[in-house]
């Protein structure tokens, strides 16, 4: 939900520098106009990794970009456009977290990231090709969704670029950002003072050409995080898509039950509470996130509250609600 | 960002049918399961139906079987919930939202347990 600013053709009275200068101090306020506008709009972002040592074995990370606070985390999976997707695993808050077949762990890692463990072989496996979407939902602001999945080529141990590309806190990044921009402007706009302060300020005439004269827009360094979000899915192979939902779950329905203590089943209040989490300072937070831990060659630390897997005693259906097979 | 729209909402005299559609965008429909709840006046939000990501499963709560039919287009990234026979007991506000709410048990259900949400669709049963 990206706000455009848009500025109507000016037409300089001649050409030369004073009618491009004219156009450019006009653009430049509805270019920090929008940018306060976007700065701080939620995002989301996924990784996905395939394991070098367990070759069948996939790690899914996805973040929040925003101040809300999260109510529910869905990840699911699918084939391309769509098709053939199902959840992998419901992350809530306070209810714990309910994850299916072939998903092995999921965890919160921090109050707004989240990561997922995959493996199974047969028809459950993971394929590297597959497209893995995350789903934040901050209530009662919205929801967010991206999606990403590991190209075919990929080699074992790297990872799928984060979706969408900005990784900064987007809070952070609208103030740095805006600042920036600010700051550069105030200088730009000092220089142009400065250099034509002896000449003639220029007139803008009304535009020469017909009112319906097309729109130039002013672009927004924030809106190529507006594009980042709809990235083209990875071609997928047919035979590689997720099971059926008959397959996936033979038993008849979720047969695990991801159990969190009630006291560790809320997300932590403040960092204490993940003291145990290493939190990297902001310039190697964005060079680890955009290299995708390449430069570390390392998992990244899996912490927090320990998930206890159990079958339930009843017997596989005993979980399952009346839709019976998801 | 998601969005969930409803619509078909309106009066009906008892016995009649309404149809109720809910508009899907900013995500990945396909693969989620959606269901329909509803809130009537001074009540607590009750779960209506749900159905699967492709649409091969359903489940209803009792009181709407063989009345209601929950329904999906995939490739219209729509959801629908046909409501037939029509009793004052219908009365409410009816939500389009992401997710199975048996994941977490049924009792005490918020929209917030949900993964997103509609602004909802008022169904007012009266003669």
């Known amino acids: 939900m990206r706000t455009e600013a848009q500025v109507p053709a000016l037409q300089p009275p001649e050409p030369g520098l004073e009618g491009a200068m004219g156009h450019r101090t006009l653009v430049l306020p509805w270019v920090l106009l929008t940018l306060c506008v976007t700065a701080g709009t939620p995002e989301v972002w996924v990784q996905v990794r395939m394991e070098a040592t367990e070759l069948s074995s996939f790690t899914i990370r996805c973040g929040f970009l925003g101040s809300g606070s999260i109510s529910l985390v869905t990840v699911s999976w699918g084939g391309p456009n769509g098709a053939g997707g199902t959840t992998l695993a419901v992350l809530h808050p306070e209810r714990g977290i309910r994850q299916w077949a072939p998903a092995r762990q999921a965890r919160w890692e921090t109050q707004s990231s989240i990561s997922l463990i995959l493996e199974g072989s047969g028809a459950s496996s993971p394929c590297a090709n597959t497209t893995f979407c995350c789903k934040f939902a901050s209530f009662p602001e919205g929801s967010w969704e991206a999606c990403g999945s590991l190209p075919p080529s990929s080699d074992p141990g790297l990872s799928a670029p984060p979706t969408p590309a900005p990784i900064l806190r987007a809070d952070l990044a609208g103030i740095l950002g805006v600042s920036g921009v600010l700051l550069f402007g105030c200088v730009y706009l000092l220089h142009l003072l400065r250099r034509h302060k002896h000449r003639p300020a220029p007139r803008l005439q009304p535009s020469r050409t017909s009112p319906q004269a097309p729109r130039a827009r002013a672009w927004a360094p924030s809106q190529a995080s507006q594009a980042a979000l709809h990235v083209p899915y990875a071609t997928i192979n047919t035979s590689c898509r997720p099971a059926t939902l008959d397959t996936a779950h033979p038993h008849g329905g979720p047969s695990w039950w991801a159990s969190l203590p009630t006291h560790a089943a809320h997300r932590p209040q403040g960092p204490a509470a993940w003291a145990s989490t290493p939190i990297p300072a902001r310039g190697s937070f964005v060079s680890v996130e955009n290299g995708l831990y390449a430069q570390a060659g390392e998992r990244p630390p899996h912490t927090g509250p320990g998930l206890t897997l159990f079958p339930d005693p009843r017997g596989p259906r005993a979980m399952e609600g009346p839709l019976g097979v998801r | 960002e998601v969005q969930l729209v409803e619509s078909g909402g309106g009066l009906v005299q008892p016995g009649g049918s309404l149809r109720l559609s809910c508009a899907a965008s900013?995500?990945?429909?396909?693969?989620?399961?959606m269901s329909w709840v509803r809130q009537a006046p001074g009540k607590g939000l009750e779960w209506v139906s749900t159905?699967?990501?492709?649409?091969?499963?359903?489940s209803y709560v009792d009181s709407v079987k063989g009345r209601f039919t929950i329904s999906r287009d995939n490739s219209k990234n729509t959801l629908y919930l046909q409501m037939n026979s029509l009793r004052a007991e219908d009365t409410a506000v009816y939500y389009c939202?992401?997710?199975?709410?048996?994941?977490?048990?049924?009792?005490?259900?918020?929209?917030?347990?949900?993964?997103?949400w509609g602004q909802g669709t008022m169904v007012t049963v009266s003669s």
């Open positions: 939202v992401e997710g199975d709410p048996h994941n977490f048990g049924l009792e005490n259900l918020a929209l917030r347990d949900f993964g997103s």
């Open positions: 159905i699967n990501s492709d649409g091969g499963r359903t």
């Open positions: 900013g995500f990945t429909f396909s693969y989620y399961d």
